[in-house]
């Protein structure tokens, strides 16, 4: 299969709310017009995947019903949110992008984002 | 050092069937995603199918959905491509895939399977 560069940013903090949202942008070389969108986790050198998706171009993407993953495109710009995110979820999260159609089938793997999770502090109690 | 071997396929005429098989030795087989490609004299390789290790979830090509079936069986370390209705234009060589992570793309390769759809 053909190679093709997929970039994303280094470095994410997770909202209080343990959402987190980063742009996964690869270099299309041809006119595809089916994609696919993995994310993988890496951490303690396992690879998990945490959500995957497929869209026509200029549609929305579709991921399962229970994904914790969310994303629109834009192009060859896919901004991804991935929601329930806990401390324990702070790892690499790596973007794979597979253009399916027409032919060729060209794979890119990002260099991950590395997404730091903190878990909210508990509010004290009051004595109201 | 995985190793793929696919065998399953040949000649057949427009409107039949047939299912390749690719055996895989070496590694953990059920923990790797498998996929099937093609590629027909003078194109470029083609993505037909792949089931994901996590789950067993599986993914079509739009001109194979409903045509094709892709299925594994983890004790026989083997992945199935069951293909009904074919057509001419399904004419290709067949080549099995693995993926080890998901984060080193498609890491091996079989030699492939000829599989000719006559009119």
């Known amino acids: 299969c053909k190679a093709m560069h997929v970039a994303q940013p280094a470095v994410v903090l997770a909202s209080s709310r343990g959402i987190a949202s980063f742009v996964c942008e690869y270099a299309s070389p041809g006119k595809a017009t089916e994609v696919r969108v993995t994310v993988l986790r890496q951490a303690d050198s396992q690879v998990t995947e945490v959500c995957a998706a497929t869209y026509m171009m200029g549609n929305e993407l579709t991921f399962l019903d229970d994904s914790i993953c969310t994303g629109t495109s834009s192009g060859n710009q896919v901004n991804l949110t991935i929601q329930g995110l806990r401390a324990m979820d702070t790892g690499l999260y790596i973007c794979k992008v597979e253009l399916m159609y027409p032919p060729p089938y060209y794979l890119g793997i990002g260099n991950g984002t590395q997404i730091y999770v903190i878990d909210p502090e508990p509010c004290p109690d009051s004595d109201f | 050092e995985v190793q793929l071997v696919e065998s399953g396929g040949g000649l057949v005429q427009a409107g039949g069937s047939l299912r390749l098989s690719c055996a895989a030795s070496?590694?953990?087989?059920?923990?790797?995603?498998m996929g099937w490609f093609r590629q027909a004299p003078g194109k470029e390789r083609e993505f037909v199918a792949d089931?994901?290790?996590?789950?067993?979830?599986?993914y079509y090509a739009g001109s194979v959905k409903g045509r094709f079936t892709i299925s594994r069986d983890n004790a026989k370390n083997t992945v199935y491509l069951q293909m009904n209705s074919l057509k001419p234009e399904d004419t290709a060589v067949y080549y099995c895939?693995?993926?080890?992570?998901?984060?080193?793309?498609?890491?091996?390769w079989g030699q492939g399977t000829q599989v000719t759809v006559s009119s």
């Open positions: 070496g590694g953990t087989f059920s923990s790797y995603g």
């Open positions: 895939a693995a993926e080890m992570t998901g984060i080193t793309g498609w890491d091996y």
């Open positions: 089931i994901r290790s996590s789950a067993g979830r599986t």
